[in-house]
């Protein structure tokens, strides 16, 4: 899950593997200022789980995300 | 090096259940999603299920929902999958696999436990 | 749910290259994994991420992924590689891990 600093959550390690879709409720993008680009995943029990916006299903969840 | 000992071959009879162990040595089952893979005499590979650790929660493959329980005790690093109402097609390998959470694809898996259901 | 078509059967010479693939609609937007399996023998994952190895694994093993097909590449075949082939992609529709039906590989 993402390390807050200074109330700007940060990410040093991806998930790899790809979360449940249905799992997942939202997302948001880490601030510019994170060393690590990085997508959030917010599960439905309310965990955070970063995530490399270059993966493909992460980039595909995104986009469903985004439709839904 | 993180290894996975499975329990030994059960034979059962038709309708019985069967519970598969598996154990983590070399680190904590908190390190892993563990899944479990099956294959049938001379067929492929089938996926029944793993758990998800981010959302504490375990996924089933539909063809096995209602039929089969997978379960963690971290306390020993041991993974269990059951499967109930067994019959003679369920008679198969079943594999534990490690799905590490910053490593994609299944890395390390068990030496597999044969169950064979038979009247 | 997502289907992987794979070629029941590949003969490849020692010293020539193999070519296993695997059809799936629209693939190229999944990650593929490729496993080895030997007989008797659990499954080895020897590509992941469509082209990535896992440590240990020769640089001989490669994968690609375009189109509707992805391809595991073995290059200078060894008498070693002789073994069934599976890939395997997450469906995020039904949130399962799909395998092939799996390639044997002969090396003749």
């Known amino acids: 899950s993402p390390y807050s600093s200074d109330t700007t959550p940060c990410c040093f390690a991806y998930i790899a593997r790809p979360l449940p879709r249905a799992h997942i409720k939202e997302y948001f993008y880490t601030s510019g200022k994170c060393s690590n680009p990085a997508v959030v995943f917010v599960t439905r029990k309310n965990r955070q789980v970063c995530a490399n916006p270059e993966k493909k299903w992460v980039r595909e969840y995104i986009n469903s995300l985004e439709m839904s | 090096q993180v290894q996975l000992v499975q329990s030994g071959a059960e034979v059962k009879k038709p309708g019985a259940s069967v519970k598969v162990s598996c154990k983590v040595s070399g680190y904590t089952l908190n390190d892993f999603a563990m899944h479990w893979v099956r294959q049938a005499p001379g067929k492929g590979l089938e996926w029944m299920g793993g758990y998800v650790p981010e959302d504490g929660d375990t996924i089933y493959a539909q063809k096995f929902q209602g039929r089969v329980t997978m379960t963690e005790d971290t306390s020993t690093d041991t993974a269990y999958m059951e499967l109930s109402s067994l019959r003679s097609e369920d008679t198969a390998v079943y594999y534990c696999?490690?799905?590490?959470?910053?490593?994609?694809?299944?890395?390390?898996w068990g030496q597999g436990t044969t169950v064979t259901v038979s009247s | 749910s997502y289907v992987l078509t794979q070629p029941p059967s590949v003969s490849v010479a020692p010293g020539q290259t193999a070519r296993i693939t695997c059809g799936g609609n629209n693939i190229e937007s999944k990650s593929v994994h490729w496993y080895q399996q030997k007989p008797g023998q659990a499954p080895v994952l020897v590509v992941y991420?469509?082209?990535d190895r896992p440590s240990g694994i020769p640089e001989r093993f490669s994968g690609s992924n375009s189109g509707n097909t992805a391809t595991l590449t073995i290059s200078r075949v060894e008498a070693g590689d002789e073994a069934d082939y599976y890939c395997?992609?997450?469906?995020?529709?039904?949130?399962?891990?799909?395998f092939g039906g799996g390639t044997k590989v002969t090396v003749l």
């Open positions: 395997q992609v997450w469906d995020s529709n039904t949130d399962h891990w799909v």
């Open positions: 696999a490690t799905d590490p959470l910053y490593t994609p694809g299944l890395y390390v």
């Open positions: 991420d469509d082209s």
